[in-house]
Amino acid sequence: AWELTILHTNDVHSRLEQTSEDSSKCVNASRCMGGVARLFTKVQQIRRAEPNVLLLDAGDQYQGTIWFTVYKGAEVAHFMNALRYDAMALGNHEFDNGVEGLIEPLLKEAKFPILSANIKAKGPLASQISGLYLPYKVLPVGDEVVGIVGYTSKETPFLSNPGTNLVFEDEITALQPEVDKLKTLNVNKIIALGHSGFEMDKLIAQKVRGVDVVVGGHSNTFLYTGNPPSKEVPAGKYPFIVTSDDGRKVPVVQAYAFGKYLGYLKIEFDERGNVISSHGNPILLNSSIPEDPSIKADINKWRIKLDNYSTQELGKTIVYLDGSSQSCRFRECNMGNLICDAMINNNLRHTDEMFWNHVSMCILNGGGIRSPIDERNNGTITWENLAAVLPFGGTFDLVQLKGSTLKKAFEHSVHRYGQSTGEFLQVGGIHVVYDLSRKPGDRVVKLDVLCTKCRVPSYDPLKMDEVYKVILPNFLANGGDGFQMIKDELLRHDSGDQDINVVSTYISKMKVIYPAVEGRIKFSTGSH
């Protein structure tokens, strides 16, 4: 028998520094977690103690904090190189700055192989990107070799900016021939490493002949055997065992997100490459694990540029940006409109001639808007200003919901109207009319939504049975502010870009902004 230790991360999303327990900015260092300096300590400890160790990343290192905004992926290559990752799969967020924003900072600088079998380059890009990412890699480990095949969510064109010269194929269809090649090479221990979410991870384990282990990402899935060490609730045991169509037991793992845990899986193979046993658990990277001093020093050196950036002007406003709770929790506020417009703008993807865009709607809990921005400071807007408006380090995500769920959400928005509660929704691509004289749960008297399958966008009545795409804060997607119906009834959820980054990019693009209150939210006569 031969034993392999797989250490894995996924969806780190730019958390290079340690964070608080909820993966936001670290406030009390004695209670902070994660970060590359702490990760390195644990990885090195395991490498010293165990003979055959692989350190793998399942994608979405990009996007999530000011680190990515400023360094644009150079920080990912630098610190992953320092940690000596063995391989990485491409995630959807690796394409957030376009293909060039992937090639230059990461693909050309990473000292480890970057993988995806289901992304095929065409046209002029094919020669430019050739060899910079690979479908598979054969990694020598001790006296054996391990094959690693990569995969990436085929939804990436809807979630990011890969351009028109990359084709995202079906994961299973693309993986099988690459696994077959590895078998031909007499590589009999094969890991599928990728970024398509837990459901697809399980399908790959079931359907792709020859895959021994699946290491996934994208869905931020937390698996654990035994009593979990922090706040995350396990979606299943670690590893999650799938019985493949050819009768093998295939372990599937994921390690939550944000570098809070280091996935730790021990696999025992027989001489023919069959998995005899698999066990492990994610390791919580809490303050009991010291930060490596040399990596920490390097982090501090790279930090300097971030502090300078946050006070630089992104653009100007010539109007007061009303982000006060007195406005945003009671009525349409222009800060809410600005943020929603930025959210839609960030999701412009012309992927189909029939649609002007794949998504037109935004909802945003008023309680998530934490500050106004005064235009009387020469109109200057900085990252620091935006961090006061959106201090929680959330993301603006893409969900699919039925019209009936949206209707419930808007009823919830005003079910206890007047108490300055955070669930009052700001909107984009939606016209809503409330009648507060009616009883809670029946106050939405008009709900029109902007069409997507149209060449000239116009507002049409919401259809209860239709499925709509909506951009919203991850806080709402997870049922926050009492929006349980969104969490329970959503048909699909893909995590998006960092909230501040979305708004800052929009302001930089527009240069001068002047959002108005324009009748997106109305109250019928006599009720307000």
């Epitope: 050309k108 480890f112 690979l134 479908p135 020598p140 090649k181 031909t184 090479l185």
Partner: antibody, heavy 119, light 107 residues
């Protein structure tokens, strides 16, 4: 573009050792295997072994085990092949090469280094 | 070790001819076969890998086929620059081995 440039020709006495270098450029050295192949005068090709600079693991043709040593210097993006206990039948052109996809054919080759073993 | 036997060892042909070189493996290697072209005083050049995949920049007159133990390299219309020695190689089992070569000469 990918380039592999080898050190110059060597003349060695039987029993001696030779170390051939292969300096790479145009790609990330640690991400690809370096393979070594030799070709005796007027003869065919013979695989010696490979090294993976990402973690310095090596694999040798049993015929060369114990005599060939493959190493790599990642800071210089250079691979080395040392052959010891040289005999006259080791006279050959020694090539380093790189693939496109692991193992699947040697796509890029050095210009070759002629090693002559003669007393 | 897996032996690869190429045939013919020598081949005389004219420009424009269709040329076929075969490579027989002593045991099955699936499709883990590459073909190379080598001219005197030069390094070998990869033509085909995975038995039938043409390497970037290789003219489409070169094609490969076969799986298991029998493989073929075909040059559909021989050009003056194609006169060289051709080698097959298997990378399915260690030690990786090459055929003895087929020298294509001008008739």
């Amino acid at each position: 573009q990918v380039q592999l440039v080898q050190s110059g020709a060597e003349v060695k006495k039987p029993g001696a050792s030779v170390k051939v270098s292969c300096k790479t450029s145009g790609y990330t050295f640690t991400r690809y295997y370096i393979y070594w192949v030799r070709q005796a005068p007027g003869q065919g090709l013979e695989w010696i072994g490979w090294i993976y600079p990402g973690n310095f693991n090596t694999k040798y043709n049993e015929k060369f085990k114990g005599r060939a040593t493959l190493t790599a210097d990642t800071s210089a993006s250079t691979a080395y092949m040392e052959l010891s206990s040289l005999r006259s039948e080791d006279t050959a052109v020694y090539y380093c090469a790189r693939d496109v996809y692991d193992y699947a054919g040697f796509a890029y080759w050095g210009q070759g280094t002629l090693v002559t073993v003669s007393s | 070790d897996i032996q690869l036997t190429q045939s013919p060892s020598f081949l005389s042909a004219s420009v424009g001819d269709r040329v076929t070189i075969t490579c027989k493996a002593s045991q099955g290697v699936a499709t883990a076969v590459a073909w190379y072209q080598q001219k005197p005083g030069q390094s070998p050049k990869l033509l085909i890998y995975w038995a039938s995949t043409r390497h970037t920049g290789v003219p489409d007159r070169f094609s490969g086929s076969g799986s298991g133990t029998e493989f073929t390299l075909t040059i559909s219309s021989l050009q003056p620059e194609d006169f060289a020695t051709y080698y097959c190689q298997q990378y399915s089992s260690y030690p990786w081995t090459f055929g003895q070569g087929t020298k294509v000469e001008i008739k």
